[in-house]
């Protein structure tokens, strides 16, 4: 499995000058160099991965990950079943769907097995980590004359989810975005029938059942308009 | 380099409460991963509460729901609001920050803090 490490955000603090710093008690040695940071996604609530950046180590290491969840019935601790490697060295743990429990606190620990002193433990709330698929099967049917509906599915709990839309004309530079709750519906009220539209859909796991800051992948895009629309007025969703 | 100094400790009944505050001084803490930990007499230091920069807060199980972590990004101070203090409570208090990459990062091990306060001594009595 090849793995995808989303990339730190600027951070340029984030490994310097380790060594200028006082520890409350141990002496500087081999088990207060700071292991990396884990980083987990909920994807869809299917599976979760939980990602390091293993060329950080200062030498190649197969770090080994255990989890838990904080005062619940699944508070013993689990080793990671499944690995995921980058360049034959541990860079993560796939989780499946039955381990994953949203709304428990998430303790993760990573380990250096060489040196068991030199671990790294955080908490996570899982519901915040959450990313869904792209919204699928977008369709566009006309309204009236210059009203034009747009709708997608997406495959989770609809009610979780908002939804950004964005369209733009063959004549614009940019796009235009409009928020959309839990509906999953989008209309344009004034189109102009001489214009080639586009729209495209994202969503998100927030605000009712998490509070998630990562969006989905976008949707394929679906057009509308110029010379294509002739065919059929009143329903068009080809996808590009 | 960091510079933490607590604040706010002190002798309390209990019963009372206490707010600790820790200043730092050298760099933003706007994306550092923050916590509170304590250290009684012949005791391990433990976590009290802990927090992302993204704003996710978790607390010890002896101080949840009477402990309250907050920030303020724009004076550079991390607070712990310490209410219903209990005699075991007692302990040296210390401010802890890691500058982080994911907003998520919130640590519970004390190994995983760069920077480091003095302490402050919070002693309740019966």
């Known amino acids: 499995l090849n793995t995808t490490i989303l990339t730190p955000n600027g951070n340029e603090d984030a490994t310097t000058d380790f060594f200028l710093t006082s520890m409350p008690t141990d002496s500087l040695s081999v088990s207060t160099l700071p292991l990396p940071e884990v980083q987990c996604f909920v994807f869809n609530v299917e599976y979760m991965n939980c990602t390091w950046n293993s060329s950080s180590e200062p030498q190649p290491t197969n770090l080994t990950l255990h989890y838990w969840y904080k005062n619940s019935d699944n508070d013993k601790v689990q080793k990671c079943s499944h690995y995921l490697f980058s360049e034959e060295i541990t860079s993560g743990c796939q989780l499946q769907k039955k381990e994953i429990h949203l709304y428990q606190t998430f303790v993760v620990q990573l380990q250096d097995p060489r040196e068991p002193r030199r671990q790294a433990t955080q908490m996570l709330k899982l519901q915040n980590l959450v990313i869904p698929w792209a919204p699928e099967n977008l369709t566009l049917r006309k309204l009236s004359e210059s009203q034009l509906e747009l709708n997608w599915n997406n495959r989770f709990l609809n009610h979780c989810l908002e939804h950004l839309v964005q369209y733009r004309t063959d004549w614009d530079h940019s796009w235009t975005e409009q928020s959309v709750d839990y509906r999953h519906k989008f209309s344009l009220p004034s189109v102009d029938g001489q214009k080639r539209y586009t729209f495209r859909v994202r969503s998100r796991f927030n605000p009712l059942c998490g509070s998630a800051q990562h969006w989905s992948e976008w949707s394929h895009p679906i057009h509308w308009g110029s010379n294509s629309s002739k065919e059929n007025p009143f329903l068009f969703a080809l996808e590009a | 380099q960091v510079q933490l100094v607590e604040s706010g400790g002190g002798l309390v009944q209990a019963g009372g409460s206490l707010r600790l505050s820790c200043a730092a001084s050298?760099?933003?803490?706007?994306?550092?991963?923050m916590g509170w930990f304590r250290q009684a007499p012949g005791k391990e230091r433990e976590y009290v509460a802990i927090d992302s920069w993204g704003g996710d807060t978790f607390y010890a199980d002896s101080v949840e729901g009477r402990f309250t972590f907050s920030r303020d990004n724009a004076k550079n101070e991390v607070y712990l609001q310490m209410n219903s203090l209990q005699p075991e409570d007692t302990a040296v208090y210390y401010c802890?920050?890691?500058?982080?990459?994911?907003?998520?990062?919130?640590?519970?091990?004390?190994?995983?803090?760069?920077?480091w306060g003095q302490g402050t001594q919070v002693t309740v009595s019966s």
């Open positions: 802890a920050g890691a500058p982080t990459s994911f907003a998520t990062t919130a640590y519970s091990s004390s190994n995983s803090y760069r920077y």
């Open positions: 050298g760099r933003t803490l706007s994306r550092y991963a």
